[in-house]
């Protein structure tokens, strides 16, 4: 199973490194339903 790695900022997903934007500093809407920034 894919596992999110909150410490490293990366996760192994289908044999490649994917940036884990669920990281604390993410501003891309990682949290379901959390308003991010303004209306764009």
């Amino acid at each position: 199973d894919a596992e999110f790695r909150h410490d490293s900022g990366y996760e192994v997903h289908h044999q490649k490194l994917v940036f884990f934007a669920e990281d604390v500093g993410s501003n891309k809407g990682a949290i379901i339903g959390l308003m991010v920034g303004g209306v764009v």
Partner: antibody, heavy 112, light 111 residues
């Protein structure tokens, strides 16, 4: 008014595929992740996966890995969720979510 | 998968009175970065869900301060200090320490 507008209800046969759309209205969908969830009748919420429209990067729940495809068309501010090899257990309301906005839900009914 | 278990599954409430919902995770949601990856959502009748609380104790925008959440790594409680009629619906806890999984939901209704 800022909203996510999903496509209408679908009725599909077992084994078929369905493609649900999610269009940003007054909202630039390419900036934030688009999450997809579903809710079977009388059941709880289940996360399917998410797509980063900026680069097309996707993450799926392992349960759906082999049957679901999340895509986006940034030129039309629309995200898509396609689910293949449908079975009766896939009957559910499917939701897209981006930033603080939720789509109204799309009911997909799988019945022979 | 991390399993989220809620109790009770049904909660009759009286307006003006407090109410609480419990949620337990099969694995600690407290990460070594100090963040607890626990969330609460409310789905009002006939509506899409909405986020109430994120990362265990943070109130989402527009959520009344009568809602609060606390807990340890595996045991969590959502509290409503004084229930209002508009609070009825199904409450879900969720985690995203590893992907996203949700509890089975707690239906809150007026007595």
């Amino acid at each position: 008014q800022v909203q996510l507008v999903q496509s209408g209800a679908e009725v599909k046969k077992p084994g078929a595929s369905v493609k649900v759309s999610c269009k940003g209205s007054g909202f630039n969908i390419k900036v934030y992740y688009v999450h997809w969830l579903r809710q079977a009748p009388g059941k709880g919420l289940e996360w399917i996966g998410r797509i980063d429209p900026e680069n097309g990067e996707t993450i799926y729940t392992p349960k759906f890995q082999d049957r679901v495809t999340l895509t986006e068309d940034t030129s039309t501010d629309t995200a898509y969720m396609e689910l293949s090899s449908l079975r009766s257990e896939d009957t559910a309301v499917y939701y897209c979510v981006s930033s603080g906005y939720w789509g109204q839900g799309t009911l997909v009914t799988v019945s022979s | 998968d991390i399993v989220m278990t809620q109790s009770p599954l049904s909660l009759p409430v009286t307006p003006g009175e407090p109410a609480s919902i419990s949620c337990r995770s099969s694995k600690s949601l407290l990460h070594r970065n100090g963040i607890t990856y626990l969330y609460w959502y409310l789905q009002k009748p006939g509506q899409s869900p909405q986020l109430l609380i994120y990362q265990m104790s943070n109130l989402a925008s527009g959520v009344p301060d009568r809602f609060s959440s606390s807990g340890s790594g595996t045991d969590f409680t959502l509290k409503i200090s004084r229930v209002e009629a508009e609070d009825v619906g199904v409450y879900y806890c969720a985690q995203n320490l590893e992907l996203w999984t949700f509890g089975q939901g707690t239906k809150v209704e007026i007595k």
